[in-house]
């Protein structure tokens, strides 16, 4: 009679993570008597996957009833496959022995490859806000995919970015892989409504890439521009001075009026108006009683935006000897070009 052969007809099996893998194995003879065992890997470091004699195998089932006397089908199914299950599986026939069974013949092996989807890309931006014209870095991470081949692209408002670096780890063989990419983005004043998108394409996604997004509103700080103007005289001895705070983001802003360097009033921006580009405008006014001043008055609008050092704009009110004769053009002179930092 011909000697027993162990036949594993499939050289390789490809399974998606979460599915069930069927590893086929048949023997050509019932002799010699002894159990079948399945191993992953070969040599002394192999892992026992299934033992016909004993053991508990929550994820492994046999295709046929191994207790039947003339059974020669030793195929198994492994459920809920993960990338960690990848490897070469060997069906091994043992000959009954004492005290131990002796390995008799092995199949040629079946390589199990696992396709696993990448996790949803997570995009993160810089820890601190940055102003327009600055370059900021965004990172994108995705994990747990297999095989290793993967494509990652960056977009800003639908336009593909080119300044980025991508690494796939580990470099060598692994059960699953991770991708990490860093993109550099130059901010503009119009970026409050902008989005940065990281797009990952993988064989498991069937042409439907995964995307992670970051809103530049979380990253950008647009500093305000200030304009101090004097309004026409409201009453005989009163001058209305306004401070226009324009095109700032985010909204967090505190304004202080100074009269000759002394704090007159402090207020926080509340009822702001929003521009189309997502930035904000705000106006504050100060009513100055000219008759209370014997000398010229230096009015300063000082703005602290988003915790940054204060910026200011000043306006000189000329107090004339004859306030009743003042017109809107002669009552004060606007010298609001004096913009400076106050620390």
């Amino acid at each position: 009679e011909e000697e027993l052969q162990v036949i594993q007809p499939d050289k390789s099996v490809l399974v998606a993570a979460g599915e069930t893998a069927t590893l086929r194995c048949t023997a050509t003879s019932l002799i010699p008597v002894g159990p079948i065992q399945w191993f992953r890997g070969a040599g002394p470091g192999r892992e026992l996957i299934y033992n016909q004699k004993e053991g508990h195998f929550p994820r492994v089932t046999t295709v046929s009833d191994l207790t039947k006397r003339n059974n020669m089908d030793f195929s198994i199914r492994i459920g809920n496959i993960t990338p960690a299950d990848a490897g070469t599986y060997y069906c091994v026939k043992f000959r009954k022995g004492s005290p131990d069974d002796v390995e008799f013949k092995s199949g040629a092996g079946t390589e199990l490859s696992v396709r696993a989807k990448p996790s949803a890309p997570v995009v993160s931006g810089p820890a601190a806000r940055a102003t327009p014209q600055h370059t900021v870095s965004f990172t994108c991470e995705s994990h747990g995919f297999s095989p290793r081949d993967i494509t990652l692209k960056w977009f800003k408002n639908g336009n593909e970015l080119s300044d980025f670096q991508t690494n796939v780890d580990p470099v060598g063989e692994s059960v699953s892989y991770s991708i990490h990419s860093t993109a550099k983005v130059v901010l503009t004043r119009e970026d409050v409504h902008s989005q940065v998108i990281c797009e990952v394409a993988h064989v498991t996604l069937q042409g439907d890439p995964l995307r992670g997004t970051a809103n530049l509103s979380e990253t950008i700080r647009v500093p305000p521009t200030l304009e101090v103007t004097q309004q026409p005289v409201r009453a005989e001895n009163q001058v209305n001075v306004t401070c226009q705070v324009r095109k700032f983001y985010p909204q967090r802003l505190q304004l202080t009026w100074l009269e000759n360097g002394n704090v007159s009033r402090t207020e926080t921006a509340s009822t702001v108006t929003e521009n189309k580009d997502g930035t904000y405008n705000w106006m504050s006014w100060l009513l100055v009683n000219v008759s209370a001043h014997r000398d010229d008055v230096k009015l300063t609008c000082q703005v602290e935006h988003d915790g940054q050092p204060a910026v200011s704009k000043s306006h000189d009110l000329k107090v004339s000897a004859h306030p009743k004769e003042q017109g809107s053009n002669t009552a004060a002179e606007n010298t609001g070009s004096n913009e400076r930092n106050i620390y």
Partner: nanobody, 124 residues
Framework: QVQLQESGGGSVQAGGSLRLSCVAS????????MGWFRQAPGKEREFVAG????????YYADSMKGRFTISRDNAKNLVYLQMNSLKPEDTAVYYC?????????????????WGQGTQVTVSS
């Protein structure tokens, strides 16, 4: 070289539960098959449960089947033994063991490394 450190032992009433943990260091944990053994006073060390390196196959001594569950967390280098419905005869020092090769319940002969043990006392 592999270092093994057991924890989670203690005293419990009959019918109670305990979970033993064993942390391994010094070698890639996912290349080691792991097992638990116990030694009662005046008796030989006996096999309790074993688990293959990926956790796909598990083995239990007949008297522990259905009461004890072995599991592992390869990310944390940990192997666990959940012991339910404990009996006074389960009182022993429980040892964690690591093997480079694993042949099911032949694990005692294949264990290359042993922990110091943790005492489990079950009173009636």
């Amino acid at each position: 070289q592999v270092q093994l450190q057991e924890s989670g032992g203690g005293s419990v009433q009959a019918g109670g539960s305990l979970r033993l943990s064993c942390v391994a260091s010094g070698r890639t944990f996912s290349s080691l098959d792991m097992g638990w053994f116990r030694q009662a006073p005046g008796k030989e060390r006996e096999f309790v449960a074993g688990i293959s390196r990926s956790g796909i196959s598990q083995y239990y001594a007949d008297s522990m089947k259905g009461r004890f569950t072995i599991s592992r967390d390869n990310a944390k280098n940990l192997v666990y033994l959940q012991m339910n419905s404990l009996k006074p005869e389960d009182t022993a020092v429980y040892y964690c063991a690591a093997a480079l090769t694993f042949r099911g319940s032949d694990l005692p002969r294949d264990s290359n490394y042993w922990g110091q043990g943790t005492q489990v006392t079950v009173s009636s």
